[in-house]
């Protein structure tokens, strides 16, 4: 069998809401994956499991089942959403994310995703992880082509 390639493209959108009393941030983060089937037969994308971490703490998880079938030598783009909650010991984030005087409230999140594919009764798992900037202060739609790879080692301007 030839390879099945999984490419994490990036964050497509992040929609934010707040609970003022609980000083809690809710971020619905939609990510985009490209899955390429380099085989001459169809493969099934059985499930996608994803989690989002902030500062080594898991703040959100998601699982999608029975997603799609990818034909021979075909590629499919799949969006998946991870609901995240930033609360409790991270409530200091609420202060930053709700600062009205600042326009961009970027925080660095680690996106982890595992894709399980199946063909002829055989399962295969492919995992990827990437650090991404996400704005926790406003609803944002990202241009994937422009912000495909964010190097978090570079200082923010």
């Amino acid at each position: 069998p030839r390879s099945i390639e999984v490419k994490y493209i990036g964050v497509k959108s992040a929609y934010v809401s707040y609970d003022a009393e609980k000083r809690t941030i809710y971020l619905n983060i939609t990510n985009t994956l490209n899955i390429t089937n380099n085989n001459y037969y169809s493969v099934e994308v059985e499930n996608i499991t994803a989690q989002v971490q902030f500062s080594k703490t898991v703040i959100g998880k998601a699982r999608l089942n029975n997603i799609t079938n990818i034909g021979p030598l075909d590629m499919k783009q799949i969006d998946y959403t991870v609901p995240t909650v930033i609360a409790e010991e991270m409530s200091y984030m609420y202060d930053f994310c709700t600062l009205l005087s600042i326009k961009v409230h970027n925080i660095v999140l680690m996106m982890q995703v595992t894709v399980t594919t199946a063909y002829f009764g055989h399962s295969e798992q492919i995992s990827q992880e990437r650090y991404q900037y996400v704005d926790c202060g406003r609803n944002t739609t990202y241009q994937l082509a422009q912000s495909e790879y964010l190097n978090v080692l570079q200082p923010q301007q």
């Epitope: 009393e21 709700t98 009205l100 005087s101 600042i102 961009v104």
Partner: antibody, heavy 120, light 112 residues
Framework: DVQLQQSGAELVRPGASVKLSCTAS????????MYWVKQRPEQGLEWIGR????????ENAPKFRGMATMTADTSSNTAYLQLNSLTSEDTAVYYC?????????????WGHGTSVTVSS | DVLMTQTPLSLPVSLGDQASISCRSS???????????LEWYLQKPGQAPKLLID???NRFSGVPDRFSGSGSGTDFTLKISRVEAEDLGVYYC?????????FGSGTKLEIK
């Protein structure tokens, strides 16, 4: 090093217009709001408004609508304040200001101010 | 517009004294997100204002702990526990909750 460099002092006639500039260094203005504040001689501070340089979206205090126009040029990293139909009441120092920060550190920056004198 | 009323207009103090400045807003300045964007600035002669406190009580970086902010809703106070010479100048409160944002009229802290 973050700096806001404002244009030099202006002496203008009543009824005339003037365009003040505020050039930023050390950061990209499209990622931050730019604010303008007025201070008349021996008086307090007045909030004129703010601009989002990325899309030109502005919010003005009603008092300054039609009289003060904020614009920005991201290619030169400069914010502008145009003051129209000037009167002696517009004799003041005009400050540009911004706030820059990340999760761990927020800083407030002000220009040195531009003095505008309206006199015939 | 939200009117910010500061008292007193002038505050003569001796060095080492405590100083207290009051700021009252004409309506609640609690934002819909639950935060109160009340700030305090100090302006010294010939200089641009400097931010001391934001969101009622958060001291800005580099601001000495003798400065403290308090209050809620419409009534706010800035206290300086022991006034030093470098604290003299004009203090302004500022609300950044409702557009247009507005400053108080200022309180001049001077030597008695």
């Amino acid at each position: 090093d973050v700096q806001l460099q404002q244009s030099g002092a202006e002496l203008v006639r009543p009824g005339a217009s003037v365009k003040l500039s505020c050039t930023a260094s050390g950061f990209n203005i499209k990622d931050y709001y730019m604010y303008w504040v007025k201070q008349r001689p021996e008086q307090g501070l007045e909030w004129i408004g703010r601009i989002d340089p990325e899309d030109g979206d502005t919010e003005n205090a009603p008092k300054f609508r039609g009289m003060a126009t904020m614009t920005a040029d991201t290619s030169s990293n400069t914010a502008y304040l145009q003051l129209n139909s000037l009167t002696s009441e517009d004799t003041a120092v005009y400050y540009c200001t911004t706030r820059i920060g990340n999760l761990y550190h927020v800083m407030d920056y002000w220009g040195h101010g531009t003095s505008v004198t309206v006199s015939s | 517009d939200v009117l910010m009323t500061q008292t007193p207009l002038s505050l003569p103090v001796s060095l080492g004294d405590q100083a207290s400045i009051s700021c009252r807003s004409s309506q609640s300045i609690v934002h819909s997100n639950g935060n109160t964007y009340l700030e305090w600035y100090l302006q010294k002669p010939g200089q641009a204002p400097k931010l001391l406190i934001d969101k009622v009580f958060n001291r800005f970086s580099g601001v000495p702990d003798r400065f403290s902010g308090s209050g809620s809703g419409t009534d706010f106070t800035l206290k300086i526990s022991r006034v030093e010479a470098e604290d003299l100048g004009v203090y302004y409160c500022f609300q950044g909750s409702h557009v247009p944002f507005t400053f108080g009229s200022g309180t001049k802290l001077e030597i008695k």
